[in-house]
Structures are given as C-alpha cells and as structure tokens.
Amino acid sequence: ESALITQQDLAPQQRAAPQQKRSSPSEGLCPPGHHISEDGRDCISCKYGQDYSTHWNDLLFCLRCTRCDSGEVELSPCTTTRNTVCQCEEGTFREEDSPEMCRKCRTGCPRGMVKVGDCTPWSDIECVHKESGTKHSGEVPAVEETVTSSPGTPASPCSLSG
C-alpha cells in the first residue's frame, strides 16, 4: 500500500472556488504546485496558502497545508509547491521517535554528568559522564538528581502536523 498522506491534521476544510489556472499534463503527470483533474486532461493549480504538491504527480487533489501549533514557530509559509515548515519554540525540541509533539528541554544534567550540547529545536541538551565521556541515555533524571545549569523556557506540548 502506498503511503500518500503525511500530514496529521486531517479535518475536512472548506474548499475555495475552483481555480481557473489550468494546463495539460505531461506524460500523464502534473508539475509541482498542481493536481490532475477528475478526467485526467488538465492540471489544476493548488491554492496558495491552502494546499500544495511537491512533485510531478497524478494526484486528484493537492495536499493540505500544515498549520503550526501553539508552541511552534513558522519558519517558512506554505506555498503551492512546499508545505509549511514549523519548528519548536525556544526551550523545546522534537525527537525523531516522538515527532508528534514538542517536548520541554531538560534544564540541567544529572549529578556526575556535564553538559556538552545545548537545547535546540531538534534535540534536548546533551550530557556526558564527567569521567568516561559517554553520552547520557536521555531519560529525564529524578528531580533531586538534577543539577540546574540554565533555566529552560516553559512551553506547552505541541503536536506535529507536517
């Protein structure tokens, strides 16, 4: 089965009036920023800021633009050929294994460890053992074990929609 839909935000949206901008498919495909018509004879432009397509395609509709959640900032807006790019707010990050939400960065490393990497929108602070220099597994330590370094920015969890 082909995995087509990558967006998580899947509520039906109100469709604007049909676009008039049309062209003919090339070898059965329409260019980025377009989808194919029901009869396969025309390419119909996606609606700027509403939907998009990134590749040559024979999709019967354009994909819906992601909307950044609260707790995320918009790095670049949705165009007809590119989805919105959202990033976690300062002090939060998104892990590859839990991409649906921004998690708060830890404010410090466990006792016996030293911070070697800062909080970024895509990674928590990085801690290594003082002696061995091996990385910490990433489990959040118990509160009493935490050595505070710099205060983190509180942020509510944010769900990924793109």
């Epitope: 082909s2 995995a3 899947l10 469709r15 029901e38 009869d39 004879r41 024979d58 019967l60 509709f61």
Partner: antibody
Framework: EVQLQQSGPELVKPGASVKISCKAS????????MNWMKQSHGKSLEWIGR????????FYNQKFKGKATLTVDKSSTTAHMELLSLTSEDSAVYFC???????????????WGQGTTLTVSS | DVVMTQTPLSLPVSLGDQASISCRSS???????????LHWYLQKPGQSPKLLIY???NRFSGVPDRFSGSGSGTDFTLKISRVEAEDLGIYFC?????????FGGGTKLEIK
Amino acid sequence: EVQLQQSGPELVKPGASVKISCKASGYSFIGYFMNWMKQSHGKSLEWIGRFNPYNGDTFYNQKFKGKATLTVDKSSTTAHMELLSLTSEDSAVYFCGRSAYYFDSGGYFDYWGQGTTLTVSS
Amino acid sequence: DVVMTQTPLSLPVSLGDQASISCRSSQSLVHSNGNTYLHWYLQKPGQSPKLLIYKVSNRFSGVPDRFSGSGSGTDFTLKISRVEAEDLGIYFCSQSTHVPWTFGGGTKLEIK
C-alpha cells in the same frame, strides 16, 4: 487484511430516506477514496460517486446528484451514504469500494463491501 | 455516458475449457495520456464483485494466471484458459477513461 463491512438490509417506505454505512479496517482510512455503487436486481452496476476522507471532498455521478449524499466519520473509519426521497427505482444492492487517490490507478475498486440490500415498498 | 456492451450475455462452458468474453465501448478508451482504463471484475453468486484485471491486462494480486485481458481502443477481451468451478459467476467490464465511470451489463459464466 483490508475489510469493508456494510450495514444490514433495509426496508423503507417510499418518500423516506435511508443511511447505509461501510466500516473500513485493515488500512489507512484517510489514504483512499471511498466509492459507492448501485446494482439493481438482475442489472449491471452503476457508479454513484466517491468521498475523499482526507479533505472531505465529494465527486458524484451527475445522475445521482440530489439522490445520494456521501459522508464519513473518520474517528470510526466509517463511510455513509444517505439516499433521499426514495422510490421503488432505488431498490437495489448498494456496495462501497475503495480506490486510489491517483488518476492512473484510481479508476478501479480493489476492495468491495459485501453489499447492503435496500427495498423500497409501501 | 460511455456505454459498455458485453457479449455473450450467458456463456455455458465445460470445466477445463477456454472461455472468452467480449466487451465493447461506445467511445475509444484510450486516454490522452496514452493509457487505457478498462477493467474486469468477477461477481460470484451472493458475493460482491472482485477485481480481476485492471488497465486492460494487469492481473490484480492473487488472481490466477489463467485469467488474461487484451484489447485496445473500443474492443476488449477477457480469456480464461482452463475454466475451474470457482470461476463461475458474472463477469463485468468497466471503464474509467471517461467520467462518469461505467460498467458493462455482465456475462454469466455457467456450466454447460
């Protein structure tokens, strides 16, 4: 395993409306169109239209506009078809069927429901 | 709408025989993209139709290789090389080149 499970038979009076359902399982519900077909007794099949669970769009065979209304409930991965102002001509077996979102592979139905028999009689 | 005409209406065969079903369309089914969107389904008694062949000659997954499709333009054929008991039922052709999509009237394959 892909399955489309339809609701049971219906006996309805002329002039009334009826809503039949098609529960999808075994695949990503939002990844395919849901189509509806009509098979009148001893006759061939007619394509009624299709619903796009991803964005809520519908596309109807002109013949069935005003007769059929297609909807889905994404939370229960169930497609519905409401048939309005019923007459004896609407008595038939109705099937749901899945098709792809792409033009080149979207014109055939790779999986079908078992059918729902509708009888319109006073 | 494109009218799909199937012949024969009924096809009595003996098990092991070859069967051939014809489907003719009122307009060419060759799309402007060069592809032909003609498909075949089998509906066994008391069941829903099942996809056999898509786009003239492509067997759907799990369909035995005794089924084959051919044709072009407006004339198409479904062949079953050696009919088995499980092949009995009504065969429908359908087209998706032109909107609305339409089906043939069906050919009933039965035991002679």
